[in-house]
Interface confidence: low
């Protein structure tokens, strides 16, 4: 083995270096000292650190550590912040043009239905918003809700529009026999289907990138143990001690040392691995009625379609609802 | 069904969107993204790694510390000496992963069983019998689009519909990310943001 | 480079006919829905008529309903405008320009135009 | 018929800020904004009321209220001055323009 240059004389290299690390030089011997105090740093011989340096020393290899591991992850939090934020907003997009494209359609096609039927969208739209960003909303509810309000609009507007207003207090009626007479045939139920397939992938898809957001912040921000930060200062910095200013770690040291401090950080790794394949496999998927970009912009196109069918029945209902509801006061249906 | 223009309207037309192979949509989008996640299926595993990396580690020098002193890069002693009445090492490891990162690990076992309770085989489709209860209704077409929709009178066939997130202020290409200045291609078992 | 170049403009006579044409480049044409908008001298911009990326939907102005006929036709990247019956008032630069819709088929103007021609002239007067 | 409303001409010093209203937008659709620039053809600035075509300086922000929107200008320099048009839909989805604004810089 060849033997070590000899270490500095004066310890002036060493408080030089020292003095970036920790301003005021009254740390750092003048020449080098027995060092029988020092914990980390054991000295073979005589020493230019002192056990304050030592201390300074640790805290500053931890604190490297903490910033390795924040540029290690850098570019992967970056990936899913970024995502996370970008799948949010066309989530958002998405619920908004599919109203705006149901509203449209009201418009365009029954005109008469407005502004009462925007009102009932709007509502119907804004929970499903709700339900992707996490709320306790029963999606059957929402389509439930939404097709309860429209029918008795879709009554008096479209099927009945003689009705005199003193009729109108038959809403609750309607909004029964709406279920029980099945008005729309099984849209709601395909609406249903539909909605709650493509809003429960989606939800969870986001859920899925926040966590991966949590999980990257978790090890982002870990604090190392003393022990470590002991092996880091040994690694890292005990060469200067010996005046050995400009030697690096051996590669394969370093290797040891670091899966020692990072043993509980690479536990995750068999879970991370699991995610991200899980989430592959959600995202693939992710189509037809599990994709809520092509359910919810399909969607006017289906209410459309669901009143057309209520029109194509009108007689029948119109006769059967005559009857039902004829005595509202009596006989609510709810 | 619901097209806007009135004389299309009452022609009942069946509209095809044109499918769009090259446009960016809300799917490619969430694909390009598991690729990209893909290349860092191995970042824990390879954290250790990068960090030495990432650190000042003798590399073309023919001496390096061990902990203790200098010794020749590739002698034994390059990896074992600096341990020695050091601390014990196989102790460290055997501590386990702290609280906060078992808390995560829980999260993380959920999710994933979330994720493939989620996932649905491939092939389902949407049951088309809408003819079952009520009066009367259309049927779709088993073809290879999603019929959304159900009237049989000129039902709208829906395909890849969004060339999406034209709208949205974000540049997700990783080029732009910070720190993301040359990047090497990554290998299989590398973490692929890493760069020396 | 996506592109638009309009051609066809000129003088003409109350009551007569022209036909512009724009030519498109740089971009996949026929997925696209596409406008012409028209500004007289020394007024603002006025939307004329639109057609859908496959051509089958149509769309007009009050102004010219009846009056003028859109189409395309995606296998020459290329978007008309027949204009008869004219009048003095559709003296105006016309631009064809492409709109920013998304792709969505069954839903146009929604987004913007997002690329104009030069614009071509049309004169109306005896 | 659906009109949009914007101010026939509004002015500034370079470097200010100013501001193009652009009322009656009442079919629930995103405003776009367009500027011409003296014998040129109009161009897309911001689209879906607040977004920018790459290419477009960050000076150029819009936002939207209600039935209102406006376009915002920080910064103002001298070949900003040009006309400035919104557009939107009316309730049959066809396009409909503003009347436009004429920018005079100072």
């Known amino acids: 083995q060849p033997p070590p240059p000899p270490p500095d004389a004066t310890c002036h290299q060493v408080r030089s270096f020292f003095q970036r690390l920790q301003p005021g030089l009254k740390w750092v011997p003048e020449t080098p000292v027995p060092g029988s105090d020092l914990q980390v740093c054991l000295p073979k011989g005589p020493t230019c650190c002192s056990r304050k340096m030592e201390e300074k020393y640790q805290l500053t290899a931890r604190l490297n550590m903490e910033q390795l591991l924040q540029s290690a992850s850098m570019e992967l939090k970056f990936l899913i912040i970024q995502n996370a934020a970008v799948f949010q907003e066309a989530f958002e997009i998405v619920v908004r043009h599919a109203k705006n494209y149901t509203n449209a359609m009201f418009k365009n096609n029954y005109p008469s239905l407005t502004p009462q039927a925007f009102e009932f969208v709007g509502e119907f739209f804004t929970d499903v918003s709700l339900y992707i960003l996490g709320s306790d909303i029963n999606v059957d509810d929402m389509v439930n809700e939404l097709f309860d309000s429209l029918f008795p609009v879709i009554y008096t507007q479209l099927m009945n529009p003689g009705l005199p207003d003193s009729a109108l207090d038959i809403n609750e009626c309607l909004r029964g026999a709406r279920r029980d007479l099945k008005v729309f045939g099984n849209f709601p139920k395909l609406i249903m289907t539909q909605v709650s397939k493509s809003l429960q992938v989606t939800r969870i898809f986001l859920q899925a990138l926040n966590l991966g957001i949590e999980v990257i912040n978790t090890t982002d921000h870990l604090k190392f143990s003393k022990d470590c930060g002991r092996m880091l200062t040994r690694m890292w910095y005990c060469s200067y001690c010996q005046g050995l200013m400009m030697v690096k770690p051996c590669g394969g040291y370093c290797n040891v040392v670091m899966q020692g401090c990072m043993a509980g950080v690479v536990e995750i790794d068999k879970y991370w691995r699991e995610y991200i394949l899980s989430l592959e496999e959600l995202v693939n998927g992710m189509y037809r009625i599990y994709d809520m970009e092509n359910v919810l912009l399909g969607l006017f196109s289906t209410i459309h379609d669901s009143i057309q069918y209520v029109q194509k029945n009108a007689g029948k209902l119109t006769t059967t609802i005559g009857k039902l509801c004829a005595h509202s006061q009596q006989r609510q249906y709810r | 069904s619901a097209y806007y223009p009135e004389d299309l309207f009452i022609d009942k037309k069946v509209l095809k969107v044109a499918h769009v192979e090259h446009e960016e949509t809300l799917s490619s989008r969430r694909r390009e993204l598991i690729q990209k996640l893909k290349s860092f299926i191995s970042f824990y595993s390879a954290l250790p790694g990068y960090i030495c990396s990432h650190s000042p580690v003798a590399e073309n020098d023919t001496l390096c510390w061990n902990g203790q002193e200098l010794v020749e890069r590739y002698s034994q002693k390059a990896a074992r000496n600096g341990m020695k009445n050091q601390f014990n090492l196989h102790e460290l490891k055997m501590k386990g992963p702290e609280p906060v990162v078992s808390q995560i690990i829980d999260k993380l076992k959920h999710i994933n069983q979330l994720l493939r309770t989620m996932s649905m085989p491939k092939g389902r489709v949407l049951d088309k019998n809408l003819d079952e209860e009520g009066f009367e209704s259309g049927d779709c077409g088993d073809d290879e689009d999603e019929c959304i929709g159900g009237s049989g009178d000129g039902m709208i066939k829906v395909k890849n519909q969004l060339r999406f997130l034209a709208e949205l202020a974000y540049d997700l290409d990783v080029d732009d990310a910070p720190g993301n200045s040359q990047q090497a291609t990554p290998k299989d078992n590398e973490i692929s943001t890493f760069h020396n | 480079e996506v592109q638009l170049v309009e051609s066809g403009g000129g003088l003409v006579q109350p009551g007569g006919s022209l036909r512009l044409s724009c030519a498109a480049s740089g971009f996949t044409f026929g997925n696209y829905a596409m406008s012409w908008v028209r500004q007289a001298p020394g007024k603002g911009l006025e939307w004329v008529s639109g057609?859908?990326?496959?051509?089958?939907?149509?769309y007009y102005a009050d102004s010219v309903k009846g009056r003028f006929t859109i189409s395309r036709d995606n296998s020459k990247n290329t978007l008309y405008l027949q204009m008869n019956s004219l009048r003095a008032e559709d003296t105006a630069v016309y631009y064809c320009a492409k709109e920013y819709d998304f792709g969505l088929g069954w839903m146009h103007y929604y987004y913007g135009m997002d690329v104009w021609g030069q614009g071509t002239t049309v004169t109306v007067s005896s | 018929q659906s009109v949009l409303t914007q101010p026939p001409s509004v002015s500034g010093a370079p470097g200010q800020r100013v501001t193009i209203s652009c009322t009656g937008s009442?079919?629930?659709?995103?405003v776009h904004w367009y500027q011409q620039l003296p014998g040129r053809a109009p161009k897309l600035l911001i689209y879906?009321?607040?977004n920018r075509p790459s290419g477009v300086p960050d000076r150029f922000s819009g936002s939207n209220s209600g039935t209102s929107a406006s376009l915002a200008i920080t910064g103002l320099q001298a070949e900003d001055e040009a006309d400035y048009y919104c557009?939107?839909?009316?309730?049959?989805?066809?396009?409909?323009f503003g009347g436009g604004t004429k920018l005079t810089v100072l």
């Open positions: 557009q939107s839909y009316d309730s049959s989805l066809n396009a409909i």
């Open positions: 009442s079919s629930g659709y995103d």
């Open positions: 057609v859908s990326g496959s051509g089958d939907g149509t």
């Open positions: 879906g009321s607040n």
